[in-house]
Interface confidence: low
């Protein structure tokens, strides 16, 4: 049985021409993996803020957004259950790994940036 995760490009509050530009980019459009394996979803961001959080959300078919995990800019790599983050501040990269994949993990995943 295949796990099929559709990953959307999501740009979070990008203020063009402002000195407080925030930008979040997810380059993968979709990823398919077998159950019980792990998948890593990449997210790159830009920010002029010096203290911030990156959030990962899962969107259900009903469009409801479920919060998964939060990574602070001053914190060690976050981990919560089957979700873990590989945070590389210098590279402005915050990748989400979902381990032991289940069929219910099939969804859209969003990366967002905030204070």
């Amino acid at each position: 049985m295949l796990f099929s995760s559709l990953l959307c490009v999501f740009v979070a509050f990008s203020y063009s021409g402002s000195s407080v530009a925030q930008k979040v980019t997810q380059a993968q459009s979709s990823v398919s993996m077998p159950v019980r394996k792990a998948v890593t979803l990449n997210c790159l961001y830009e920010t002029s803020w010096w203290s911030y959080y990156i959030f990962w959300y899962k969107q259900l078919p009903s469009k409801e957004m479920i919060f998964l995990i939060r990574q602070g800019s001053d914190e060690q790599n976050a981990k919560s259950g089957r979700y873990s983050v590989n945070f590389k501040k210098a590279a402005k990269s915050v990748a989400l790994t979902i381990s032991a994949l289940q069929l219910e993990d099939s969804a859209k995943y969003f990366c967002a940036l905030g204070e």
Epitope: F13, S18, V20, W50, G72, Q76, G114
Partner: antibody, heavy 114, light 107 residues
Framework: QVQLQQSGAELVRPGASVTLSCKAS????????MHWVKQTPVHGLEWVGD????????AYNQKFKGKAILTADKSSSTAYMELRSLTSEDSAVYYC???????WGQGTSVTVSS | TPLSLPVSLGDQASISCRSS???????????LHWYLQKPGQSPKLLIY???NRFSGVPDRFSGSGSGTDFTLKISRVEAEDLGVYFC??????????FGGGTKLEIK
């Protein structure tokens, strides 16, 4: 461009109240906490408190609890600080600031005098 | 009233900041920051978390220190550097607190 535009100078009587405003533009107002800072020659810079405009949640410096009330109007992207029961000790310049990006208003001077 | 530090243009200036308790957060970071306030202006961030220069801040500004003792160095003072320098901490919040300030002025 991010801007925090504060209201003009205030001259108020002892015992009265005053409300200062801080209009934000150039960023998503509800996403970032608005902080207020008091400055006097004697005490320097003092953090009054902060408000999360998205949720209305506030945090105050114990020293200013009951003195300052922080609110916000999301529709106009404006933060407010009401100062109550004013005395000469409240005479100061008050700044609003979106702290973790280092954006500050120009400051509002409050003078309490009879 | 801020302390006064008279300097000559082109000289190095060192401004110190001492905390009554360690500013090392439980997450390992030290939230000690430096601001410059020029006359008639609001404060502007120079250095955050001890040694990180904020965007647009010239490299003649550097921060160092650990625990309770911190220093801001200006390698070659220029006229535009004059003003009051404040340290501030956000390790133990609320409240976010500031030092009393050091006024950098021409000797």
């Amino acid at each position: 461009q991010v801007q925090l535009q504060q209201s003009g100078a205030e001259l108020v009587r002892p015992g009265a109240s005053v409300t200062l405003s801080c209009k934000a533009s150039g960023y998503k107002f509800i996403d970032y906490e608005m902080h207020w800072v008091k400055q006097t020659p004697v005490h320097g810079l003092e953090w009054v408190g902060d408000l999360d405009p998205g949720t209305g949640v506030t945090a105050y410096n114990q020293k200013f609890k009951g003195k300052a009330i922080l609110t916000a109007d999301k529709s106009s992207s404006t933060a407010y600080m009401e100062l109550r029961s004013l005395t000469s000790e409240d005479s100061a310049v008050y700044y609003c600031t979106v702290w973790s990006a280092d954006f500050w208003g120009q400051g509002t001077s409050v003078t309490v005098s009879s | 009233t801020p302390l006064s530090l008279p300097v000559s243009l082109g000289d190095q200036a060192s401004i110190s900041c001492r905390s009554s308790q360690s500013l090392v957060h439980s997450n390992g970071n030290t939230y000690l920051h430096w601001y410059l306030q020029k006359p008639g202006q609001s404060p502007k961030l120079l250095i955050y978390k001890v040694s990180n220069r904020f965007s647009g801040v010239p490299d003649r500004f550097s921060g160092s220190g650990s625990g309770t003792d911190f220093t801001l160095k200006i390698s070659r003072v220029e006229a535009e550097d004059l003003g009051v320098y404040f340290c501030s901490q956000s390790t133990h919040v609320p409240p976010w607190t500031f030092g009393g300030g050091t006024k950098l002025e021409i000797k």
